[in-house]
C-alpha cells in the first residue's frame, strides 16, 4: 500500500480468482484513543472499533472511503483505491490503446517546436467518475523539472454506439534550450482513477522525435503569364522555432485533383515557394517537416486552384 | 530521406553542401545498422544516449545562434570570443562566429572518425561479417574536415590487444551512430545558419 495523495491510498493486488488479497491496517488520524468506530462509504454498519482497523482487501467491495468516528463526529477519512495486477501485468482498463505508432500506446505526445513545450493526449470510453493527474520530468534518476497543467476533456467523438473521450494536457520543460541535443528523454506519467480503480500510464520520448510543425501559413497562388503554371508561396508557421535559418523546414507541395483517385503531383523543396501546374478543380496543398531531423510532417495547408 | 530536393547553388557557403552529405550518410548508415542488427538493442528507445564529445567539445554552446543567446537555458558553458580562421569562414563577416564553433565541429568529426575507424577494424575481424561502416560515411567525414581546414594534432587510432567482444562492439556502433546523427543535425543547422548570415 502507498499514499497517492493526502488520505488517498493505493492497494496493489494480484488479481485472480480466490486471491488472498492484501492485509491493510488503517489508523485514525486523531489524538483520541477510545470510543472510535469505523464505517465504509455511506453504510452505517460498524466495521470495527479502536484507533486502528485491520482489513483484508480482496476486491472493489473492500475499497472505498473508510471513516473513523467518535460519538457521531467524523475524525478522519482514508480512501482506498485498487491497482490490479493480472498475470504480472498492471491493468490498463481505463485508457484505450491508440495502437499508433505501435501497440500498447496509451499516451501520445506532440510538440510544435523545440521550445520544450509539448501536448499529450489519451482516449477513454469512460465518461463519469474519472480523474487524471499528470507529472513529467526530464530523465528519471536525477529528474529535471517539467511543469504540466491540468488534464482537460479536449474532444468527444461518437464511435458506433459508444462515445470516445479525448483528454489532453500541456507541459513545459522548465529550462529548455531549443538548440540543445537531448540525451535524457522526457518522462510523462499519468495517474488515472475511475471510481475505486487506480492505473498509471507512462510515455518516454525525446522532443526531437515528437516534433510536428503547424501547417505552413499564408499559402498563396500567383498565376504566371501565358502559362498554366502558378507560383505557390507560403511562410513558416508562427509557432515554429526561430531563427528559421537554424531551425529550417523542408516542404512538400502537392497538386490534387477533385477525385481522390487522380494522380497526385508532388514536389519537395527547401524554399518557401514553388512553381506547379494548376489543373482545373484541383487544389494545392503544402506541408512542412524539420529539414534535418525527419519527425512528423505537419497537416496540409490547402488552397483551391481556381 | 529519399526525396527530390533542389541542389545547392555552387557559390554557397562551402561547408553547407558537405554537412548535408554528412547527415544523409550517417542517417543511411544508422538505418542500415538498425535493419542489419534488428535483434540487437539498436533503436533510439533501447540504447543509452552517450556523447563521446561530452566535456571535450562544446559545439552546441559555441555554435549557438545569436537569437538564442538571450535564452538563459542555452548559456551553460558558452564561450564568447570569435572565430578568425578556417576556410569555411571565407568572406563571411558575422558576429555569430564565436570561438570554437567551427573548430569544435572539426574536433567532433575527428573524434568520431577515430572511433569509427577503430570500430571498423574490430568489425572486420567478426567471423559473422555482419556489418561494416559505410566507406562513403567515412569519406564524407573526411571531406567536411578538409573543408573546415583546421590544423590539429592527429589523434592516434586506438588499438586493442584483447579479443574484441563483437556483441558489445555492435551495440557501441548503434550508440555512436545515434549520437553522431544528432550531432550531424546540429552541424547542418549551424552551417545553414552561417550560410544565411
Amino acid at each position: 500500500i502507498w499514499e497517492l495523495k493526502k488520505d488517498v491510498y493505493v492497494v496493489e493486488l494480484d488479481w485472480y480468482p480466490d486471491a488472498p488479497g492484501e492485509m491493510v491496517v488503517l489508523t485514525c488520524d486523531t489524538p483520541e484513543e477510545d470510543g472510535i468506530t469505523w464505517t465504509l462509504d455511506q453504510s452505517s454498519e460498524v466495521l470495527g472499533s479502536g484507533k486502528t482497523l485491520t482489513i483484508q482487501v480482496k476486491e472493489f467491495g473492500d475499497a472505498g472511503q473508510y471513516t473513523c468516528h467518535k460519538g457521531g463526529e467524523v475524525l478522519s477519512h482514508s480512501l482506498l483505491l485498487l491497482h490490479k495486477k493480472e498475470d504480472g501485468i498492471w491493468s490498463t482498463d481505463i485508457l484505450k490503446d491508440q495502437k499508433e505508432p505501435k501497440n500498447k500506446t496509451f499516451l501520445r505526445c506532440e510538440a510544435k517546436n523545440y521550445s520544450g513545450r509539448f501536448t499529450c493526449w489519451w482516449l477513454t470510453t469512460i465518461s463519469t467518475d474519472l480523474t487524471f493527474s499528470v507529472k513529467s520530468s526530464r530523465g528519471s534518476s536525477d529528474p529535471q523539472g517539467v511543469t504540466c497543467g491540468a488534464a482537460t476533456l479536449s474532444a468527444e467523438r461518437v464511435r458506433g454506439d459508444n462515445k470516445e473521450y479525448e483528454y489532453s494536457v500541456e507541459c513545459q520543460e522548465d529550462s529548455a534550450c531549443p538548440a540543445a541535443e537531448e540525451s535524457l528523454p522526457i518522462e510523462v506519467m499519468v495517474d488515472a482513477v475511475h471510481k475505486l480503480k487506480y492505473e498509471n500510464y507512462t510515455s518516454s520520448f525525446f522532443i526531437r522525435d515528437i516534433i510536428k510543425p503547424d501547417p505552413p501559413k499564408n499559402l498563396q497562388l500567383k498565376p504566371l503569364k501565358n502559362s498554366r503554371q502558378v507560383e505557390v508561396s507560403w511562410e513558416y508557421p508562427d509557432t515554429w522555432s526561430t531563427p528559421h535559418s537554424y531551425f529550417s523546414l523542408t516542404f512538400c507541395v502537392q497538386v490534387q485533383g477533385k477525385s481522390k483517385r487522380e494522380k497526385k503531383d508532388r514536389v519537395f523543396t527547401d524554399k518557401t515557394s514553388a512553381t506547379v501546374i494548376c489543373r482545373k478543380n484541383a487544389s494545392i496543398s503544402v506541408r512542412a517537416q524539420d529539414r534535418y531531423y525527419s519527425s512528423s510532417w505537419s497537416e496540409w495547408a490547402s488552397v483551391p486552384c481556381s | 530521406r529519399n526525396l527530390p530536393v533542389a541542389t545547392p547553388d555552387p557559390g554557397m557557403f562551402p561547408c553547407l553542401h558537405h554537412s548535408q552529405n554528412l547527415l544523409r550518410a550517417v542517417s543511411n548508415m544508422l538505418q542500415k545498422a538498425r535493419q542489419t542488427l534488428e535483434f540487437y538493442p539498436c533503436t533510439s528507445e533501447e540504447i543509452d544516449h552517450e556523447d563521446i564529445t561530452k566535456d571535450k567539445t562544446s559545439t552546441v554552446e559555441a555554435c549557438l545562434p545569436l537569437e538564442l543567446t538571450k535564452n538563459e537555458s542555452c548559456l551553460n558553458s558558452r564561450e564568447t570570443s570569435f572565430i578568425t580562421n578556417g576556410s569555411c569562414l571565407a568572406s563571411r563577416k558575422t558576429s555569430f562566429m564565436m570561438a570554437l564553433c567551427l573548430s569544435s565541429i572539426y574536433e567532433d568529426l575527428k573524434m568520431y572518425q577515430v572511433e569509427f575507424k577503430t570500430m571498423n577494424a574490430k568489425l572486420l575481424m567478426d567471423p559473422k561479417r555482419q556489418i561494416f561502416l559505410d566507406q562513403n560515411m567515412l569519406a564524407v567525414i573526411d571531406e567536411l574536415m578538409q573543408a573546415l581546414n583546421f590544423n590539429s594534432e592527429t589523434v592516434p587510432q586506438k588499438s586493442s590487444l584483447e579479443e574484441p567482444d563483437f556483441y558489445k562492439t555492435k551495440i557501441k556502433l548503434c550508440i555512436l551512430l545515434h549520437a553522431f546523427r544528432i550531432r550531424a543535425v546540429t552541424i547542418d543547422r549551424v552551417m545553414s545558419y552561417l550560410n544565411a548570415s
Epitope: F60, T125, I126, H194 | -
Partner: antibody, heavy 117, light 108 residues
C-alpha cells in the same frame, strides 16, 4: 429523504410532456439522479442520469427524444415528441452519493404516462 | 453494452434456494446492483458493489462476482421473496446504467 414523480397523464403522439421529480430532505447538488421507465408487463429501462454537477447522460436509444435538467429541488424529464411506444410508468431515483458513482437507493412511486391517439 | 440475466423465471419452494445470474458484455469490475420489484411498486435496492448488502436487507440475500459474471443468491426462501429481480450496472454513464431483463421468482 424522499423523491416523487409527477406530470404523468394521457397525451396524444407528438405532444411534448415534462415529468417532474421533486426531492426533499437532501440537496441535488450532492447526488446523481436517474430516470427509469417500465412499460406495462415489461422490465426496467434506463433513460438517463443527471450528475451532481449537472451533466446529463442518456441511454444510446434516446437519440434526443428525452432531455433531463434540474433546478435546486426538482429534476425534469422532457419528452420531446412522445410515441405510443413511450407508454410506461416513469420512475425517478436518487444515487447513493458515495465517493464513487451510484447505485440507486431511494425511488419514487412512479408516474404513468399513456401515449395514445 | 448489455446485461444478460438468467433465468427469466424460476420457481422454488419455501425454505429453498434460488440463484440468479447476470452477465455483462464487458468488464464492469464490481459496479453492479441488484433490485427487487413487486407488482405496483418501485424497485428496492438489495445489493450494491456486487456483494454488499443494502441497509435493512436480510442476510438471506447475497451477491457475488466481479468483472463480467455476477450472481444473486436467495436462501431460506420466504413467500415475501416472490418478486422480479433485476441487476443493474453503474460502471459508467457511457457504457450505460442499464438493467438486466429481470428474473421472476415464484415461491411455492
Amino acid at each position: 429523504q424522499s423523491v416523487e414523480e409527477s406530470g404523468g397523464r394521457l397525451v396524444t403522439p407528438g405532444t411534448p410532456l415534462t415529468l417532474t421529480c421533486t426531492v426533499s430532505g437532501f440537496s441535488l447538488s450532492s447526488y446523481t439522479m436517474i430516470w427509469v421507465r417500465q412499460a406495462p408487463g415489461e422490465g426496467l429501462e434506463w433513460i438517463g442520469i443527471i450528475s451532481a454537477g449537472g451533466s446529463a447522460y442518456y441511454a444510446s436509444w434516446v437519440n434526443g427524444r428525452f432531455t433531463i435538467s434540474k433546478t435546486s429541488t426538482t429534476v425534469d424529464l422532457k419528452m420531446t415528441s412522445p410515441t405510443t411506444g413511450d407508454t410506461a410508468t416513469y420512475f425517478c431515483a436518487r444515487g447513493s452519493g458515495t465517493y464513487t458513482s451510484d447505485y440507486f437507493n431511494i425511488w419514487g412511486p412512479g408516474t404513468l404516462v399513456t401515449v395514445s391517439s | 453494452f448489455e446485461l444478460t440475466q438468467t433465468p427469466s423465471s424460476v420457481e422454488a419452494a419455501v425454505g429453498g434456494t434460488v440463484t440468479i445470474k447476470c452477465q455483462a458484455s464487458q468488464s464492469i469490475d464490481s459496479w453492479l446492483a441488484w433490485y427487487q420489484q413487486k407488482p405496483g411498486q418501485p424497485p428496492k435496492l438489495l445489493i450494491y458493489s456486487a456483494s454488499k448488502l443494502a441497509t435493512g436487507v436480510p442476510s438471506r440475500f447475497s451477491g457475488s462476482g466481479s468483472g463480467t459474471q455476477f450472481t444473486l443468491t436467495i436462501s431460506d426462501l420466504e413467500c415475501a421473496d416472490a418478486a422480479t429481480y433485476y441487476c443493474q450496472s453503474y460502471y459508467d454513464a457511457n457504457a450505460g446504467y442499464g438493467f438486466g431483463g429481470g428474473t421472476k421468482v415464484v415461491v411455492v
